[in-house]
């Protein structure tokens, strides 16, 4: 998908406004130290694309995190402010759905989190020199 | 069942405001879009706003900025639409209608409609 | 924004084929696969026919068919039936500011 054309305005609205959240809780216990950023973007679309990716693609190691609380939302708004995600995406992503047999959080997952955290706060800082 | 139950008929002076209620009940309330349409005796549809409880987003239709207040309280399962400053003009039925799961466009469940009437 | 163009109506015989336009722009219609058609008989809720241009919600008899060319969505009724008599909304996704524009509505006459 190309995520040229999201609003990207209302899509930092709800990251600041809920999604963050629901990442920090995941987070919960963990310090911001313990993991390395690995993963970088260098635009608005590059980071939704990794952003998506990484919330909803497998990994060995850390199954599924597309039925977490900020993964749900992070589908809710991409859905919304991105036309065409949604027919493109969606269908993509029930498969994984039931590839998560429990709920682990593993340290891998935390990991996976930790990236997903930078790439957002990445997004709203390449969004802020925009403006 | 799967269900949108609304609220009853309400009769209003010119200037005062409405709120109109719509309780789901059989599918998880937070995931869809939850959208207000309303329908002038012998008009045809007109789109109000909608409100997606699971990111808290509202979207209203321009026309009715700042006279219309979508709000949801995933607790009951019940979405709500406020209309102010009434004139005789929001005489009409008033739906509410689910948008479906991240496909929040098209609306695939309807309450029975609530008649709004606007007299003084 | 305004509304999306329908004609008032539209009629045919039982048996008949019977197509209703939906006019729109580049900004509605003709920029997404999404748009949805609405059956309403008098004093009853809409309810859904099609949705993104050409998908029948299941329980929807497969006389109903949708299609879309440029800015022009169409909705087919074929093998009419008195049941079918009764008003047709188009609608259509608009984009992230506008959201949702609908027609003003086509009232179908079985003759």
């Known amino acids: 998908y190309d995520f040229t054309n999201c609003d990207f305005q209302k899509i930092e609205a709800d990251y600041l406004r809920t999604i963050s959240k629901d990442l920090i809780t995941y987070m919960s216990g963990t310090k911001s130290t313990d993991f390395n950023n690995t993963v970088s973007c260098s635009n608005r679309p590059h980071c939704l694309t990794e952003i998506q990716s990484l919330t909803f693609n497998p990994t060995p190691r850390c199954a599924s995190l597309a039925k977490e609380m900020f993964a749900r939302k992070t589908k809710a708004t991409l859905a919304l402010w991105c036309p065409g995600y949604s027919e493109t995406q969606i269908n993509a992503t029930q498969a994984m759905k039931k590839a998560r047999k429990s709920k682990v959080t593993t340290n891998k997952c935390l990991e996976q989190v930790s990236q997903l955290l930078g790439l957002w706060r990445r997004f709203i800082r390449t969004l802020l020199k925009k403006q | 069942q799967v269900q949108l139950v609304q609220s009853g008929a309400e009769v209003k002076k010119p200037g005062s405001s409405v709120k109109v209620s719509c309780k789901a009940s059989?599918?998880?309330?937070?995931?869809?879009?939850i959208n207000w349409v309303r329908q002038a005796p012998g008009q045809g549809l007109e789109w109000l706003g909608v409100?997606?409880?699971?990111?808290?987003?509202?979207i209203y239709a321009e026309k009715f900025q700042g006279r219309v207040t979508i709000t949801a309280d995933t607790s009951t399962s019940t979405a709500y639409m406020e209309l102010s400053s009434l004139r005789s003009e929001d005489t009409a039925v008033y739906y509410c209608a689910r948008g479906q799961e991240y496909f929040y466009w098209y609306f695939d469940l309807w309450g029975q409609g609530t008649l709004v009437t606007v007299s003084s | 924004q305004s509304a999306l163009t329908q004609p008032p109506s539209a009629s045919g015989s039982p048996g008949q084929s019977v197509t209703i336009s939906c006019s729109g722009s580049s900004s509605d219609i003709g920029g997404y696969n999404r748009v949805s058609w609405y059956q309403q008989h008098p004093g009853k809720a809409p309810k859904l026919m099609i949705y993104?241009?050409?998908k029948r919600p299941s329980g929807v008899p497969d006389r109903f068919s949708g299609s879309k060319s440029g800015n022009t969505a169409s909705l087919t009724v074929s093998g009419l039936q008195a049941e079918d008599e009764a008003d047709y909304y188009c609608s259509s996704y608009a984009g992230t500011d506008t959201f949702i524009l609908f027609g003003g509505g086509t009232k179908l006459t079985v003759l």
């Open positions: 409100i997606v409880p699971l990111v808290g987003v509202t």
């Open positions: 993104d241009v050409s």
């Open positions: 059989g599918f998880t309330f937070g995931s869809y879009g």
